[in-house]
């Protein structure tokens, strides 16, 4: 038994990394094989994660954390029974995913405005919460090519646009993602898109 | 609520022994390493010794080590501190502390007087 | 003799910004992260900083901790009266397998 693609792990900086690898063959991971983890602080003592299959011969692993800071370092080993397949290490900061943003709702209420909000993944006391931007995926469920990003990049989980810059009477669907520049992070998941119908008063014109 | 509760000080001659208690409460005690510190009167806060979660690992200061036993009952929440061979330099408030990277909560502490 | 070394005392005036710093001999390792705790006159210790920068919820944002080399500093901006204290630095040293505390710095808030 060999690893044939060696773990990459991301974390949320929360308290989840994910770690993904694959073997040579066909493997049953949650029975054949672990991955211990152990923060590399004096007092910490090693984790064990069953891993889950994902595909004939990939593995999936999620390591819980407690919570994450920028100086940490983790150990990384994987056994097979008594043989040690992988030895490696992780710095959570440094490969950070962050969590999708939740509770997308569009308000369609406001006099020809669309608002759009969501939830900040992350709770007040984490690093992140304060340092996440955005990025708003509108498209029409009629019409493949109406397709629209909006990038928000400023703290405030929501996004007003006008609802005359979207076709009028057809229904459309947003989502919304999240990354956080300080760490460099690799986009999140998109969020659960929400579909809302698009109406608004054609102005009169003038002759 | 995180609680941590010292018991067991008191005078003792020199070369005598001792046994502090820390009774936690309030968080998951098995999952977090522990400390005792300890401060001399008008002094500085001096760490002790300290042990992980499953108690594999113990670690001690140097002016200690030999005389000083640290071990935890994670049954029964409670951290322990056995001290022989007392010395007057060994006067101080004993703290007990939880380990999570830093000593992030401290109970009220115990003293620890040692003389004849 | 502390393998830390801080200021035996520091001072200043309510609204003011103070800074304590934290020094490890030359030979100190670099590897440990720095925590900070206040000890508030004739009361148990508690948690400022860990992690050299990171604040536990509770704590007011006017405490900031950083982190150079082989040393840190704590920065008290907005002094209060309440802010009158003893503060420690402290860090775990892989080389010794110990925990190890500076000697203290008592912070006078003056007027």
């Known amino acids: 038994m060999k690893v044939l693609q060696e773990p990459t792990c991301v974390s949320d900086y929360m308290s989840i990394s994910t770690c993904e690898w694959k073997m040579n063959g066909p493997t049953n991971c949650s029975t054949e094989l672990r991955l211990l983890y152990q923060l590399v602080f004096l007092l910490s003592e090693a984790h064990t994660c069953i891993p889950e299959n994902n595909g004939g011969a990939g593995c999936v692993c999620h390591l819980l954390m407690d919570d994450v800071v920028s100086a940490d370092n983790y150990t990384l080993d994987l056994w097979a029974g008594q043989q040690l397949l992988w030895k490696g290490s992780f710095k959570p900061s440094e490969h950070v995913k962050p969590r999708a943003p939740g509770n997308l709702t569009v308000h369609t209420n406001v006099s020809d405005t669309l608002l759009l909000t969501w939830s900040n993944p992350y709770p007040p006391d984490n690093y992140l919460y304060n340092h996440l931007t955005y990025a708003v995926n509108i498209w029409s469920e009629n019409d493949p090519a109406d397709f629209r990003i909006y990038n928000v990049t400023y703290l405030e989980p929501s996004l007003r646009i006008a609802a005359s810059t979207l076709k009028s009477g057809i229904s459309y669907r947003a989502r919304v993602r999240a990354w956080a520049q300080c760490y460099n992070t690799t986009w999140s998941e998109w969020s659960p898109s929400t579909k809302w119908h698009n109406s608004y008063r054609e102005p009169f014109e003038q002759h | 609520e995180v609680q941590l509760l010292e018991s067991g000080g008191g005078l003792v001659q020199p070369g005598g022994s001792l046994r502090l208690s820390c009774a936690a409460s309030?968080?998951?005690?098995?999952?977090?390493?522990m400390a005792w510190v300890r401060q001399a009167p008008g002094k500085g806060l001096e760490w002790v010794s300290a042990i992980t979660m499953s108690g594999r690992g113990i670690y001690y200061a140097d002016s200690v080590k030999g005389r000083f036993t640290i071990s935890r009952d994670n049954s029964k929440n409670t951290l322990y501190l056995q001290m022989n061979s007392l010395r007057a330099e060994d006067t101080a408030v004993y703290y007990c502390?939880?380990?999570?990277?830093?000593?992030?909560?401290w109970g009220q502490g115990t003293l620890v007087t040692v003389s004849s | 003799q502390s393998v830390l070394t801080q200021p035996p005392s520091a001072s200043g005036t309510p609204g003011q910004r103070v800074t304590i710093s934290c020094s490890g001999s030359p030979l100190f390792p670099d590897s440990g992260s720095f925590n900070w705790y206040q000890q508030l006159p004739g009361t148990a210790p508690k948690l400022l900083i860990y992690?050299?920068?990171h604040r536990p919820s509770g704590v007011p944002d006017r405490f900031s901790g950083s982190k150079s080399g082989t040393s840190a500093s704590l920065a008290i901006s907005g002094l209060r009266s309440e802010d009158e204290a003893d503060y420690y630095c402290g860090t775990w040293d892989y080389s010794l397998s110990a925990y190890v505390l500076g000697g203290g710095t008592k912070l006078t808030v003056l007027g």
């Open positions: 309030g968080f998951t005690f098995s999952r977090h390493a």
């Open positions: 992690a050299d920068s």
């Open positions: 502390a939880r380990v999570h990277r830093a000593f992030d909560y």
